[in-house]
């Protein structure tokens, strides 16, 4: 769920989850076009991860999952079902992906009209 997503980003850092609310073409709601930078690519891969989970019958925004934060590390589980495991893994990958990136203010509140119609294929 969205609470867990925000929590995992907070856990790993280095920025507030709010920094990604509307960044580039993929950080925030929806997404299309070519990802703008490393942060945007992280969000793009996270969207793909959620799409795969959704195709498997999970509800990324509805399915809450148990997890713990220890020393800026995410510990997923214990999961009650496979969706909890998959979604925690998606959020964990995003958090670690974002941790090693450089932030570009020019992509904050990036107008979606500047994002191309076509998106890269999820692998």
């Amino acid at each position: 769920g969205l609470l867990e997503l925000a929590g995992t980003l907070d856990c790993v850092g280095p920025r507030s989850p709010m920094a990604y609310m509307n960044y580039g073409c993929y950080c925030g709601l929806g997404g299309h076009g070519e990802p703008r930078d490393a942060i945007d690519w992280c969000c793009y891969h996270h969207d793909c991860c959620y799409s795969r989970a959704q195709d498997a019958g999970c509800s990324p925004k509805l399915d809450r999952y148990p997890w713990k934060c220890m020393d800026h590390h995410i510990l997923c589980g214990p999961a009650e079902n496979k969706c909890q495991e998959l979604l925690c893994r998606c959020d964990e990958e995003l958090a670690y992906c974002l941790a090693g990136t450089e932030y570009h203010l020019k992509y904050l509140f990036f107008p979606s009209i500047l994002c191309e119609k076509d998106s890269p294929k999820c692998n």
Partner: antibody
Framework: QVTLKESGPGILHPSQTLSLTCSFS??????????VGWVRQPSGKGQEWLAH???????YYNPPLKSRLTISKDPSKNQVFLTIPNVNTANTATYYC??????????WGQGTTLTVSS | DIQMNQSPSSLSASLGDTITISCHAS??????LSWYQQKPGNIPKLLIY???NLHTGVPSRFSGSGSGTGFTFTISSLQPEDIATYFC?????????FGGGTKLELK
């Protein structure tokens, strides 16, 4: 069209090992999000979930039965296997193979009946 | 394990009737409830998943609702081919657990 078919011994004596095979078609167990599970139903009673195995080889066993069950798969042959050693009369039931997604059972096999009798 | 309490265990109805079956979970299962139909000597068939979503090819006279711990399954305008046993299943927490079933008969 998804189909699953169970095969088993039909009759066993107490202390023997039950080996069940589920042969399926219409899907691949290499597909993200899919699993195959086993359910049993003693005559006139409710269903009991036994175990399931996922596309990524993650396995789940119903905790009270965990030490007695082994589930495995051969995706290349579209087969899943369940073994229960040392059966007794409490294992008399119809055993169903199912195709599962993380939150529900999508398809069921026709079931195979096991009678444990001395 | 999550207990699923299904009622009634049997039900008599006439063709054209609307019938309702209930399923109660012992703890919150969100919307992760499915409904199945099993005719004598036949394979159980998924009718509804995620509380209210109709599985492919299932007629629209079947419907489901509910969330949390209380769920309802409805057949509007009962047809002869609907005579069967219906059961629910929770998918929030493994092991999957099932309701005891409702045997539907013609009056």
């Amino acid at each position: 069209q998804v189909t699953l078919k169970e095969s088993g011994p039909g009759i066993l004596h107490p202390s023997q090992t039950l080996s069940l095979t589920c042969s399926f078609s219409g899907f691949s167990l290499n597909t993200f999000g899919l699993g195959v599970g086993w359910v049993r139903q003693p005559s006139g009673k409710g269903q009991e979930w036994l175990a399931h195995i996922w596309w990524d080889d993650d396995r789940y066993y119903n905790p009270p039965l965990k030490s007695r069950l082994t589930i495995s798969k051969d995706p290349s042959k579209n087969q899943v296997f369940l073994t229960i050693p040392n059966v007794n009369t409490a294992n008399t039931a119809t055993y169903y193979c199912t195709q599962i997604l993380p939150h529900w059972v999508a398809y069921w096999g026709q079931g195979t009946t096991l009678t444990v009798s001395s | 394990d999550i207990q699923m309490n299904q009622s009634p265990s049997s039900l008599s109805a006439s063709l054209g009737d609307t019938i309702t079956i209930s399923c109660h979970a012992s703890q919150n299962i969100n919307v992760w409830l499915s409904w199945y139909q099993q005719k004598p000597g036949n394979i159980p068939k998924l009718l509804i998943y995620k509380a209210s979503n109709l599985h492919t090819g299932v007629p629209s006279r079947f419907s489901g609702s509910g969330s949390g711990t209380g769920f309802t399954f409805t057949i509007s305008s009962l047809q002869p081919e609907d005579i069967a046993t219906y059961f629910c299943q929770q998918g929030q927490s493994y092991p999957f657990t099932f309701g005891g079933g409702t045997k539907l008969e013609l009056k």
